[in-house]
Interface confidence: low
């Protein structure tokens, strides 16, 4: 991969349908402990290692060339819980138009095995520059993986790698409104391998979700559901062992 990842490119909204402009913390990372390609708990876990590895300090090689990673991130080894109080961020009520998610993350499930299907609450919904990171391992002989970003009973963004659809591997994206699925968007590039670890990163942009797998840009999916702040849950399901699921702001 080229060494041209920058925050500016990731957020500039260029018309490139297959942009390589992920933030510095996304791309071209050396493999870290635990065998996650690209980095060991990068992105949403600045300064924090996988369970049992490098306690209290950053894993080796994380964030080369990405100074500061995520400003305002917690000190090494610290895993803050989400703010108390009802509803969204900040805890005084629903998020304001600006600063709804100050970059103080990550929030989400602590690192460690998680039960699948798993629901990651997104208490204030999603907002542009929000980065969701999911780490796990595909089970042997896997059939499917699914991420469902949900607004009430609607599925705003369904990301569904299928390992054997008519003897082909394909990623299907869609939206479900009023129990009706819309037009499918299909992607034949398939970066998942049965039995192997993976990292999925979803970057929320004003007009679309941008998805990278193992530090390589995969696809983008235009928003079909308005009111992003009400997409308040991420469902993770399928044939995976889930290690962690979290989000932060970049």
């Amino acid at each position: 991969m080229a060494d041209n990842f920058s925050l500016h490119d990731a957020l500039s909204g260029s018309g490139n349908p297959n942009p390589q402009g992920w933030p510095g913390a996304w791309g071209n990372q050396p493999a870290g402990a635990g065998g996650y390609p690209g980095a060991s708990y990068p992105g949403a876990y600045p300064g924090q290692a996988p369970p049992g590895a490098y306690p209290g300090q950053a894993p080796p090689g994380a964030y080369p060339g990405a100074p500061g990673a995520y400003p305002g991130a917690p000190a090494p080894g610290v895993y803050p819980g989400p703010p108390s109080g009802p509803g969204a961020y900040p805890s005084s009520g629903q998020p304001s138009a600006t600063g709804a998610y100050p970059a103080t993350g990550p929030y989400g499930a602590p690192a460690g095995p998680l039960i699948v299907p798993y629901n990651l609450p997104l208490p204030g919904g999603v907002v542009p520059r929000m980065l969701i990171t999911i780490l796990g391992t595909v089970k042997p002989n896997a059939n499917r993986i699914a991420l469902d970003f949900q607004r009430g009973n609607d599925v705003a963004f369904h990301f569904n790698p299928r390992f054997n659809e008519n003897n082909r591997r394909v990623i299907v994206c869609n939206t479900k409104l009023d129990n009706n699925w819309g037009r499918e968007e299909r992607q034949s590039v398939f970066p998942f391998e049965s039995g192997k670890p993976f990292k999925i990163q979803v970057l929320v942009e004003p007009d679309h979700f941008k998805v990278a797998v193992n530090d390589a840009h995969l696809l983008q999916y235009n928003h079909r559901v308005k009111k992003l702040n009400e997409i308040s849950k991420l469902g993770i399901s399928g044939d995976i062992d889930l290690t962690s699921a979290s989000y932060t702001m970049i």
Partner: antibody, heavy 116, light 109 residues
Framework: QVQLQQSGAELMKPGASVKISCKAT?????NYWIEWVKQRPGHGLEW???????????HYNEKFKGKATFTSDTSSNTAYIHLTSLTSEDSAVYYC?????????WAQGTTLTVSS | QAVVTQESALTTSPGETVTLTCRSS?????????ANWVQEKPDHLFTGLIG???NRAPGVPARFSGSLIGDKAALTITGAQTEDEAIYFC?????????FGGGTKLTVL
């Protein structure tokens, strides 16, 4: 097709409370947010807030917190707005609106008059 | 709270193209504001025209279109009809609340 039918006009005394209903037909009631909007002559349209019957989620305009409360009865596909401590400032037409990806479906409105 | 501003009144002729705009006091209107356009006709009859900046509602004539023009949301009626005479409200979404504009009274003479 999608239809929203609100309850009839209300004449209330200051200090009283009122509950306005909005019956939905033609779609899955629990899946869509219901917005509530207030219209007063000379004041245009004001968003009171919204309510998702499926899980009880709600958002309120700060101005109407303590004044309005949203509820629903999913067995009858009916949404409600409960207005308390009524004053003449609450005299208005109140609308329920089904929020959708590409459009809003508006009910016919309920006229509330608060007068002693 | 943000203030949303519309032209108070516009006049057009049948067959002409007219554009109504919607400005936000907080800066440029973006797709994240999910601009909605609603038509009000006499007797409190409201019809949703456009949602999510540029998505035309089912059954709404193709002459109605939504867009962003410069730093504002816009509703364009291409080939106005006499039945388009109405008040048009825009509404902008601000992270967790909706704000309506004051409405534009469109006269089609």
């Amino acid at each position: 097709q999608v239809q929203l039918q609100q309850s009839g006009a209300e004449l209330m005394k200051p200090g009283a409370s009122v509950k306005i209903s909005c019956k939905a037909t033609g779609y899955t009631f629990t899946n869509y947010w219901i917005e509530w909007v207030k219209q007063r002559p000379g004041h245009g349209l004001e968003w009171i807030g919204e309510f998702l019957p499926g899980d009880g989620s709600s958002h309120y305009n700060e101005k109407f917190k303590g004044k309005a409360t949203f509820t629903s009865d999913t067995s009858s596909n009916t949404a409600y707005i409960h207005l308390t401590s009524l004053t003449s400032e609450d005299s208005a037409v109140y609308y329920c609106v089904r929020d959708d990806y590409d459009s809003d479906y508006w009910a016919q409105g309920t006229t509330l008059t608060v007068s002693s | 709270q943000a203030v949303v501003t519309q032209e108070s009144a516009l006049t057009t002729s049948p067959g002409e193209t007219v554009t109504l705009t919607c400005r936000s006091s907080t800066g440029a209107v973006t797709t994240s504001n999910y601009a909605n356009w609603v038509q009000e006709k006499p007797d409190h009859l409201f019809t949703g025209l456009i949602g999510g900046t540029n998505n035309r509602a089912p059954g709404v004539p193709a002459r109605f279109s939504g867009s962003l023009i410069g730093d504002k949301a816009a509703l364009t009626i291409t080939g106005a009809q006499t039945e388009d005479e109405a008040i048009y409200f825009c509404a902008l979404w601000y992270s967790n609340h909706l704000v309506f504009g004051g409405g534009t009274k469109l006269t089609v003479l």
